[in-house]
């Protein structure tokens, strides 16, 4: 029997210092492209090395991002939501949802002899 | 990860023109940011054309002679090259990466790219 798969969701608020190249990721999403099934919100899909974000070491991939300097992101275009990154200065407050996968074991009792997978 | 797959190189006359694809694998294709880059035996590899959610951009090498374009439906990004010079012989290399950056894009920059296709040949014979 297979476990459920079940997420840890936790939000986080992270003060990145904009760095020589920028604050260093790449996003997806807004209203015009949806990354998530029915979520038209933004999300990390890249940290790049050595940059503030990296170095920072707190973003992830796959974090969505609720706002930005107090501003929400939600209902924004995707260009609109880079635009709103480009223009939020040198320190930039990030509030973030992390989405943890945790792994549940098989549902019901499990034996002696059964694996520990 | 991420695959990408170049074709439609050839051999061509100067003056002639070639429609270069590159297929890529993945679910969210219309979100890539995608570049073709070349490189020219002993030479420094070189930026051609890039395309992202929000526009077009291209060396002044190519510009006017050269189109970049994709189709999301079909997971794949184009090079129509018209108007081909001997010059433009070179392997022709697709680039991508998940998402737009948050900062200035720097399409010429490889470092913007994480994935890379093998190429295709593509000579123009005078």
């Known amino acids: 029997m297979n476990g459920r798969v079940d997420y840890l969701v936790t939000e986080e608020e992270i003060n990145l210092t904009r760095g020589p190249s920028g604050l260093g990721f790449n996003i997806v999403g807004g209203t015009d492209q949806q990354y998530v099934s029915n979520d038209s919100g933004i999300y990390v899909s890249r940290i790049k090395e050595n940059g503030a974000a990296a170095l920072d070491g707190r973003l992830q991939e796959g974090d969505k991002i609720l706002s930005v300097n107090g501003q929400d992101l939600k209902n924004l275009l995707h260009q609109d939501a880079v635009d709103l990154f480009r223009n939020a200065g040198y320190a930039v407050s990030l509030r973030v949802q992390h989405r943890l996968q945790v792994q549940n074991g098989p549902i019901g009792h499990r034996g002696e002899g059964d694996p520990s997978g | 990860d991420v695959q990408l797959v170049e074709s439609g190189g050839g051999l061509v006359q100067a003056g002639g023109s070639l429609r270069l694809s590159c297929t890529a694998s993945?679910?969210?294709?219309?979100?890539?940011?995608m570049a073709w880059f070349r490189q020219a035996p002993g030479k420094e590899r070189e930026f051609v054309a890039a395309?992202?959610?929000?526009?077009?951009y291209y060396a002044d090498s190519v510009k006017g002679r050269f189109t970049i374009s994709r189709d999301n439906a079909k997971n794949t990004m184009y090079l129509q090259m018209n108007s081909l010079k001997p010059e433009d012989t070179a392997v022709y290399i697709c680039?991508?990466?998940?998402?737009?950056?948050?900062?200035?894009?720097?399409?010429?920059?490889?470092?913007?790219?994480?994935?890379w296709g093998q190429g295709t040949q593509v000579t123009v014979s005078s």
């Open positions: 680039a991508a990466v998940i998402g737009s950056t948050v900062d200035s894009y720097s399409p010429s920059d490889p470092l913007e790219y994480d994935y």
């Open positions: 993945g679910r969210t294709f219309s979100t890539y940011t």
């Open positions: 395309i992202t959610w929000s526009g077009t």
